[in-house]
Amino acid sequence: AGSDSLYVPCAPSPCVNGGTCRQTGDFTFECNCLPGFEGSTCERNIDDCPNHRCQNGGVCVDGVNTYNCRCPPQWTGQFCTEDVDECLLQPNACQNGGTCANRNGGYGCVCVNGWSGDDCSENIDDCAFASCTPGSTCIDRVASFSCMCPEGKAGLLCHLDDACISNPCHKGALCDTNPLNGQYICTCPQGYKGADCTEDVDEGNSHHHHHH
């Protein structure tokens, strides 16, 4: 204030944020601050976070004479102490028929046979544990596998010699290999029968299957 004007410390009040001014001398004042503020003119917000009670990785966010906890996604509540039920919030949290199981601070998926991963989205590679005979090709399926055999091999694991290789079926019959035992099966054309379709049959009889 200039020398020609009368200085009154509390007029106007220098106190901010709702602080009340009290004149303490001819040229001095004191601000009585509202809770949550400090400073000679109540200009400074008091940081309420130093003694915060945010738990489970919650981050303290200072307010005016209070604080809030910013919780990680798995937790909720004033101090991040309440578990979030992810199974309720995300009905499709587990894929491919997996069952959601809520846990403290997270959730887990119980996957059906053939699937794995946090959300059961990964098809288990059954070929990793398959015993297809060397030289054959393993094809992964859901909870199973199949072996693609090279020429001359047969069976579920391509571990058998293919009996059809020697063309045992005659008269243009169709030759198949029994995947269990590797033996040939001849599907005879009309008019023929027998293990290798070499026998004539009576008219009226249809196709014959013979196993050997």
Partner: antibody, heavy 120, light 107 residues
Framework: EVQLVESGGGLVQPGGSLKLSCAVS????????MEWIRQASGKGLEWIAA??????????VYSASVKDRFTISRDTSKSTLYLQMNSLKTEDTAVYYC???????????WGQGTLVTVSS | DIQMTQSPSSVSASVGDRVTITCQTS??????LAWYQQKPGKSPKLLIY???RLQDGVPSRFSGSGSGTDYTLTISSLQPEDFATYFC?????????FGGGTKVEIK
């Protein structure tokens, strides 16, 4: 006229101690918050400590970088603010300023600064 | 701690130019911002407090504005004595934090 004059700076070895003083005049010392701020050569300003006014029991707050190593205090009878610096590190090398917190979010008076060099 | 992002870090200008410096805070500081001028080898000098209030004795070509997290210092017509480094500082809560500074240089 408000005046702040720092002294006590100098060369000190790492791990050593130094006490800075800030003599003030021209205002009622006990009515104001007082701050210490430092500035490394060619760098920005870094607040390091504050002592609140008498109405707030002269309570103290420190920055994380100096907490447990530096101590701020004042002697109202001598109108002097102090900064006791212990366990000094090379990164404490800077010009140290004392300033008056004028309220209303401004540091309205500063000393001329005193240079502290921490080196072996 | 409240982070202060000041830009630009330097600006080249001529006498008479209008210069604008900005300061962004990491959270709302409710206008609790000050601007300082510092010349080489000297201590900082308070220009603006409370985001927009001019400190006694500071020329009116300096002005401050802003609220929330965005603040601006404007020098309406640059004078030879204004070539210096300018800092913003939040006084809303401890620890007090400063911007990195803006050096105003002669073009």
């Amino acid at each position: 006229e408000v005046q702040l004059v720092e002294s006590g700076g100098g060369l000190v070895q790492p791990g050593g101690s130094l006490k800075l003083s800030c003599a003030v005049s021209g205002f009622t010392f006990s009515d104001f918050y007082m701050e210490w701020i430092r500035q490394a050569s060619g760098k920005g300003l870094e607040w390091i400590a504050a002592q609140r006014n008498k109405a707030n029991d002269f309570s103290i707050v420190y920055s994380a970088s100096v907490k447990d190593r530096f101590t701020i205090s004042r002697d109202t009878s001598k109108s002097t603010l102090y900064l006791q610096m212990n366990s000094l590190k090379t990164e404490d090398t800077a010009v140290y300023y004392c300033s008056r917190d004028g309220g209303r979010w401004g540091l309205d008076a500063w000393g001329q600064g005193t240079l502290v060099t921490v080196s072996s | 701690d409240i982070q202060m992002t000041q830009s630009p870090s330097s600006v080249s200008a001529s006498v008479g130019d209008r210069v604008t410096i900005t300061c962004q805070t990491s959270e709302d500081i409710y206008s609790g911002l000050a601007w300082y001028q510092q010349k080489p080898g000297k201590s900082p000098k308070l220009l603006i407090y409370g985001a927009s209030r001019l400190q006694d004795g500071v020329p009116s070509r300096f002005s401050g504005s802003g609220s929330g997290t965005d603040y601006t210092l404007t020098i309406s017509s640059l004078q030879p004595e204004d070539f210096a480094t300018y800092f913003c500082q939040q006084g809303f809560k401890y620890p007090l934090t400063f911007g990195g500074g803006t050096k105003v240089e002669i073009k």
